[in-house]
Amino acid sequence: MAVTACQGLGFVVSLIGIAGIIAATCMDQWSTQDLYNNPVTAVFNYQGLWRSCVRESSGFTECRGYFTLLGLPAMLQAVRALMIVGIVLGAIGLLVSIFALKCIRIGSMEDSAKANMTLTSGIMFIVSGLCAIAGVSVFANMLVTNFWMSTANMYTGMGGMVQTVQTRYTFGAALFVGWVAGGLTLIGGVMMCIACRGLAPEETNYKAVSYHASGHSVAYKPGGFKASTGFGSNTKNKKIYDGGARTEDEVQSYPSKHDYV
């Protein structure tokens, strides 16, 4: 039950995260005009990954797309790439995780297959979240660098008399949406990976009881039946090793005071 809840919650958190990454990528407010300590302008500039916009105090808003590909800064291209990779991985992860959900029955899909799919989607969500966080952080770093550069020469004097105000840009809403969304996707991915551990039917090489005896001895189940190695071979005169951790179904295989003859 806990596994199903963890998986379901991981799916929902990742879904919200990926929706947020998509929203952030499409948003125009990645960088917004810094209004602090600036002359009050009747024009507000803001920029996204795909276009830049100007909102006038009259209410008129005009947005222009970046129609050039080669003319754009390499950093912007890198951020675009990271966000798109994040979205693509996240979308594939969502698709995979839908089929991996324990509450959804698809044919005769085994738990091991669901576990693998859960792990795959979890890893995809983690990478998707990291891509988004990296993309947003790269853009934020670019803004900080440009901000201090433009602050250094906030007013560039022209002929001593005329002044040109340099527009400074600060963090836009999309950055915060991106950080939160990336974090949620990452958390969702981790939850899916945790759920995968609980889903996996933990296979053992030998389902017999391990014990050490001085003479010829045989391991018996309480019903008097000879314990099996899992391969149908005789256990007489052999040291039998447990192949690892057991599932709940194997509990009766543990030695008890009745197991020795």
């Epitope: 024009v43 803001y46 009259s58 209410g59 527009t167």
Partner: antibody
Framework: EVQLVESGGALVKSGGSLRLSCAAS????????MSWIRQTPEKRLEWVAT????????YYPDSVKGRFTISRDNAKNTLYLQMSSLRSEDTAFYYC???????????WGQGTLVSVSA | DIVMTQSPSSLTVTAGEKVTMSCKSS????????????LTWYQQKPGQPPKLLIY???TRESGVPDRFTGSGSGTDFTLTISSVQAEDLAVYYC?????????FGSGTKLEIK
């Protein structure tokens, strides 16, 4: 057709108060930034106040800040200018204008005269 | 505050002549975001309120005759009337629409001989 009709202009004593109104029609009033501009007897144009869409922000020049208040009633399609502590230099023709693209004033009313006597 | 300086303060021309008037701002009115200059030109005929002629320094308002042309960028702007008509008798004002407070030039009075 866009129409802006100002009213409320009068002769007032220095230090007095006055409220100007501007009735708007022919456009969606609530979707536009509105302004008051005055023209002095020397024919100089002076921007007095601007209220943006929604009325959340208002802007004034230092010469009237704290004395004049621009407001709007979108339900009545009316723009107001509350003037207090009037001075002789406030004597002017007051125009109400609709702000459009480029923050320019595309539509102006016919104006109302405010005279402040010493 | 931004100071808008217009020159000449008045000019007298004959009908059909080409007229240019200048407007200078104390700070650049060019917005880097959209590469537009927030300067507006108005025409005020006697006994009338001002009428919008040109916005964004060079965009003609609809209904304005194409003999009116705005040009310039940054701090220096010009209004040109290619062939003056008798009905162009008016005072022409330029305005800063970029910085608050919005400021107007003192005007250029155009008179016809």
């Amino acid at each position: 057709e866009v129409q802006l009709v100002e009213s409320g202009g009068a002769l007032v004593k220095s230090g007095g108060s006055l409220r100007l109104s501007c009735a708007a029609s022919g456009f969606t009033f609530s979707n536009n930034a509105m302004s008051w501009i005055r023209q002095t007897p020397e024919k100089r144009l002076e921007w007095v106040a601007t209220i943006i869409i929604g009325g959340t922000y208002t802007y004034y020049p230092d010469s009237v800040k704290g004395r004049f208040t621009i407001s709007r009633d979108n339900a009545k399609n009316t723009l107001y200018l509350q003037m207090s502590s009037l001075r002789s230099e406030d004597t002017a023709f007051y125009y109400c204008a609709r702000q459009v693209y480029g923050n320019s004033f595309a539509y102006w009313g016919q104006g109302t005269l405010v005279s402040v006597s010493a | 505050d931004i100071v808008m300086t217009q020159s000449p303060s008045s000019l007298t021309v004959t009908a059909g002549e080409k007229v240019t008037m200048s407007c200078k701002s104390s700070q650049s009115l060019l917005n880097s975001g959209n590469q537009k200059n927030y300067l507006t030109w108005y025409q005020q005929k006697p006994g009338q309120p001002p009428k919008l002629l040109i916005y964004w320094a060079s965009t003609r308002e609809s209904g304005v005759p194409d003999r009116f042309t705005g040009s310039g960028s940054g701090t220096d702007f010009t209004l040109t009337i290619s062939s003056v008509q008798a009905e162009d008798l008016a005072v022409y004002y330029c305005q800063n629409n970029y910085f608050y407070p919005f400021t107007f030039g003192s005007g250029t009075k155009l008179e016809i001989k």
